[in-house]
């Protein structure tokens, strides 16, 4: 079982060799495509392969902002050729992510296919790591091999790579081990209950609040740190401001997501940026301790 997601992929190429990407659709070049063209071939060691975000079978929805559906294969190819002259292309790609049934806590193994020059899409953090503590997956690149498995998420503890235990392994060494792996990488992962934002811990409830700015400020101050897994919390509310007037937001509440973008594994600076670009309607997912009235 899979679900589809979309991501933006930026490739840098050159006019001679292009991006190392071939698309397929229809049965002749000038046929109007009723569905987006598919990636049918990725050249080894090309920009398309090295980016690690594209796979054969992915649907290319747009090329440099121009939709491919209802266009022709010749037009799509021409867009790629033109982009190669400019050395850069931005692709909007739709791909499948496995719907994995995974426990919210526990230890398990994940096997990922790997090529030497291609990143898995995992960022490792040693944030506030004390001796003997596990490394933490702080980010997973959308569209990467790691993302498509559907099993990994920010906050997962990385215990071993190909049976090499990482208990006292410096982060730099772990990154190097990951880079050098080939064919199939086996990761030993631990998920903890407290890593799951969705899991409603005892005495806590999570809910969503929608705020319409109407051009004005939200009236909230947030605090946290640049450590990826420190919580982002409401540290202040402007008196009679928009957020306070809802009655649903209080100082000390934890923000789990802004406009459906999870803050899991994100530092304070990113949360601030998400609020700045949130637009007129801002949706906050809040986690509240129930030891005070709603």
């Amino acid at each position: 079982i899979v679900h589809t997601e979309t991501t933006e992929v930026v490739l840098c190429g050159d006019p001679l060799s292009g991006f190392g990407l071939q698309l397929q659709g229809g049965i002749f070049a000038t046929e109007t495509l009723s569905s987006p063209p598919l990636v049918c071939f990725i050249e080894p060691d090309s920009p398309a392969e090295r980016c690690g975000l594209l796979q054969v079978g992915d649907r290319v929805l747009s090329i440099n902002g121009i939709a491919t559906e209802d266009g022709t294969m010749e037009e799509a190819n021409q867009l790629l050729r033109d982009a190669a002259l400019a050395h850069k292309v931005v692709l909007e790609v739709e791909f499948d992510v496995a719907e994995s049934v995974i426990p919210s806590s526990g230890t398990f193994h994940v096997k990922l296919p790997k090529k030497r020059s291609v990143e898995l899409g995992i960022t490792i953090s040693s944030a506030s790591r004390k001796r003997g503590e596990p490394l933490i997956i702080s980010d997973i690149k959308k569209g990467s091999v790691a993302h498509r498995t559907g099993t990994l998420e920010p906050g997962d503890k990385l215990l071993a790579i190909d049976n090499i235990r990482l208990d006292n392994c410096p982060m730099e060494d772990a990154v190097q081990i990951l880079r050098q792996c080939e064919d199939l990488v086996k990761l030993k992962i631990r998920k903890d209950e407290d890593n799951s934002d969705e899991l409603e811990t005892t005495g806590a409830v999570s809910y969503t609040v929608e705020l319409k700015r109407y051009g004005g400020p939200l009236g909230i101050t947030i605090s946290g740190t640049e450590e990826p897994f420190d919580p982002i919390v409401i540290s202040g509310l402007t008196k009679r401001g928009l957020a306070e007037r809802t009655g649903a937001i209080h100082v000390g509440d934890r923000i789990l997501a802004i406009n459906n973008v999870s803050l899991k594994g994100r530092p304070l600076s990113e949360a601030i940026h998400l609020l700045q670009v949130a637009g007129e309607t801002v949706t906050l997912k809040i986690k509240k301790q129930l030891d005070r009235p709603l």
Epitope: Q22, G26, I27, F28, A29, T30, S34, F41, M73, E74
Partner: antibody, heavy 121, light 106 residues
């Protein structure tokens, strides 16, 4: 090894019907468009029909439109051509071919050995 | 429909000769052109795709060139097994073939 094996050809009277089959092996059948190409005795090649990998899109030459129907059964790795209202000019060797898109061109990269259809009274 | 016209319709040549067959499209087809070889009683075989790309397993004495409306298939040094009929085919619109060029031994 990619293999395509046509069957179902034979002698049929004008106005009659015939169903050709093409059994495919050695590749992921559902991932490829397939096509029928024919060759009248002593003549050149003429594209007849094509079908997308999923079977959702079909294409026909004007000379057979409305009379021939292309279909496929991906669970059986088999391509079909249902030929109705046959005419003398449909007499030909019918080839099943895999139709691929690669490097800015669509081409017939593998062909069957062909099956002869003769329309005569 | 796009018409594909091959020339010559037939030609005689000797082993070791350099041979050129041309194919002209009735309108521009970019590089969406393929070349096939067919021997009597056999199915056609793909030689060149996308005007100039050599199909895997095809000897390097075969080469293709051209784009737009004019295309060429060249055999640099004829071998005995090269005597056959050659067809061009466009895939810019629904597929159509040229009428064929029969290459015979002089």
């Amino acid at each position: 090894e990619v293999q395509l094996l046509e069957s179902g050809g034979g002698l049929v009277q004008p106005g009659g019907s015939l169903r050709l089959s093409c059994a495919a092996s050695g590749f992921t059948f559902s991932s490829y468009a397939m096509s029928w190409v024919r060759q009248a005795p002593g003549k050149g090649l003429e594209w007849v029909s094509a079908i997308s990998g999923s079977g959702g899109s079909t294409y026909y030459a004007d000379s057979v439109k409305g009379r021939f129907t292309i279909s496929r059964d991906n669970s059986k790795n088999t391509l079909y051509l249902q030929m109705n209202s046959l005419r003398a000019e449909d007499t030909a060797v019918y080839y099943c071919a895999r139709y691929v898109y690669y490097s800015y061109s669509y081409s017939f990269d593998y062909w069957g050995q062909g099956t002869l259809v003769t329309v005569s009274s | 429909d796009i018409q594909m016209t091959q020339s010559p319709s037939s030609l005689s040549a000797s082993v070791g000769d350099r041979v050129t067959i041309t194919c002209r499209a009735s309108q521009s087809i970019s590089s969406y052109l393929n070349w096939y070889q067919q021997k009597p009683g056999k199915a056609p075989k793909l030689l060149i795709y996308a005007a100039s790309s050599l199909q895997s397993g095809v000897p390097s004495r075969f080469s293709g060139s051209g784009s737009g409306t004019d295309f060429t298939l060249t055999i640099s040094s004829l071998q005995p097994e090269d005597f056959a009929t050659y067809y061009c085919q466009q895939s810019y619109y629904l597929p159509t073939f040229g009428q064929g060029t029969k290459l015979e031994i002089k």
